[in-house]
Interface confidence: low
């Protein structure tokens, strides 16, 4: 079956800046700002767009060692990000995958609302464990608040549109590490 859980949470950070840091550069930021929650993120394949597979590893002491995420959609205009947890963690005999949608919406006060949808695709008649949903929500909240704190402390970070130009790269826009580009373009 499919079990859908929807939540909303607010942030004082403007939507565009939060999307840039929390979504586009989360791979780099999470191990830095929340090492107690995420120990590393590695791009397994892809260039950051749909189809990209990432391995997120957790530090010792957490219930799971790792999960693998598949990027399904990155909408830079509407600050929307869809991805699915496809391996590791809770995925197994009873749970096939978790499809997640995050949309960041600007609020009049200059902050933002994160609208989050988590669809748990279970195998057969299995139900979703409440503690799993709770743990997942807590992890998301931990990461969000850690990134939020970082952005409040570093007022110049992720503010200006300072993407590296194609001219600088001698190639396409760079939104991921050189190794990841190499994986995508040369293999």
């Amino acid at each position: 079956g499919v079990f859908n859980y929807e939540t909303e949470t607010t942030s004082v950070i403007p939507a565009a800046r939060l999307f840039k840091a929390f979504i586009l550069d989360g791979d780099n930021l999470f191990p830095k700002v929340a090492p107690q929650a995420i120990s590393s993120v590695e791009n397994i394949e892809g260039n950051g767009g749909p189809g990209t597979i990432k391995k997120i590893s957790f530090p010792e002491g957490l219930p799971f060692k790792y999960v693998k995420d598949r990027v399904d959609e990155v909408d830079h205009t509407n600050f929307k990000y869809n991805y699915a947890v496809i391996e590791g963690g809770p995925i197994g005999d009873t749970l096939e995958k978790i499809s997640n949608e995050i949309k960041i919406v600007a609020t009049p006060d200059g902050g933002s609302i994160l609208k989050i949808s988590n669809k748990y695709h279970t195998k057969g008649d299995h139900e979703v464990k409440a503690e799993q949903v709770k743990a997942s929500k807590e992890m998301g909240e931990t990461l969000l608040r850690a990134v939020e704190s970082y952005l409040l402390a570093h007022s110049d970070a992720y503010n200006e549109q300072k993407l590296i130009s194609e001219e600088d790269l001698g190639g396409e826009q760079k939104l991921i590490s050189e190794e990841d580009l190499h994986h995508h373009h040369h293999h």
Epitope: K20, A21, L24, D25, N28, P31, K32, P35, S39, S40, V41, E42, I44, E45, K55, S57, D156, A157, Y158, N159, E160, Q161, K162, L163, I164, D168, L169, K174, L175, I176, S177, E178, E179, H182, H183, H187
Partner: antibody, heavy 118, light 113 residues
Framework: QVQLVQSGAEVKKPGASVKVSCKTS????????ITWVRQAPGQGLEWMGW????????NYAQNVQGRVTMTTDTSTSTAYMEVRSLRSDDTAVYYC???????????WGQGTLVTVSS | DIVMTQSPDSLAVSLGERATINCKSS????????????LAWFQQKPGQPPKLLIY???TRESGVPDRFSGSGSGTDFTLTISSLQAEDVAVYYC?????????FGQGTKLEIK
């Protein structure tokens, strides 16, 4: 703590091959790539390439492409770099290094001196 | 390739005085959509591997004395040792890790005057 321990010094003749090992410990080997850097006597640091310990993907510097092969053995958490068709200007200390989650070169092996001499 | 050029090639500074080493990159070393400059500074003493001092141009690595500081952005970067100590005698390298090949500066040899 994170440690990278490299194999001992080697003396090779021109045209021969050398394989340097880098045994890692203190972290999950497959979560981080391994970079190789060399330093000729009295010279600066030269990046040689990188290998993903997760899937073996590689990225070699242009000047060593074709003569260098980087591999890993996940069962022993060890990275290897082989240099073929050695020349005298390959005489150098070879270092392995592990990047941090933030991508900088944080942890280094102690270095392996490779001397190429007839 | 991004070319990293350090100046000066060698530097002699009195104990307790300030030492400044410059590094210029041929291209910006900004990474992704953040404002982080992917530039590191290393210290290397004879017979030892390089030791990371600074990353992101200005963030001190854990355990590095606070007399070491990094600054700069764009293409111009500086490593400053506010009060030179005897154990700071070494060769210092800047390195960009934004775009492969990850290039190093040619090194600056720091000595005591």
């Amino acid at each position: 703590q994170v440690q990278l321990v490299q194999s001992g010094a080697e003396v090779k003749k021109p045209g021969a091959s050398v394989k340097v090992s880098c045994k890692t410990s203190g972290y999950t080997f497959t979560n981080y790539g391994i970079t190789w850097v060399r330093q000729a006597p009295g010279q600066g640091l030269e990046w040689m390439g990188w290998i993903s310990a997760y899937n073996g993907n590689t990225n070699y510097a242009q000047n060593v492409q074709g003569r260098v092969t980087m591999t890993t053995d996940t069962s022993t958490s060890t990275a290897y770099m082989e240099v073929r068709s050695l020349r005298s200007d390959d005489t150098a200390v070879y270092y392995c290094a592990r990047r941090s989650s933030m991508l900088h070169f944080q942890h280094w092996g102690q270095g392996t001196l490779v001397t190429v001499s007839s | 390739d991004i070319v990293m050029t350090q100046s000066p090639d060698s530097l002699a500074v009195s104990l307790g005085e300030r030492a400044t080493i410059n590094c210029k990159s041929s291209q910006h070393v900004l990474y992704d959509s953040s404002n982080e400059n992917y530039l590191a500074w290393f210290q290397q003493k004879p017979g030892q591997p390089p030791k990371l001092l600074i990353y992101w141009a200005s963030t001190r690595e854990s355990g590095v004395p606070d007399r070491f500081s990094g600054s700069g952005s764009g293409t111009d970067f500086t490593l400053t040792i506010s009060s030179l100590q005897a154990e700071d005698v070494a060769v210092y390298y800047c390195q960009q890790y934004s775009s492969a090949p990850y290039t190093f500066g040619q090194g600056t040899k720091l000595e005591i005057k």
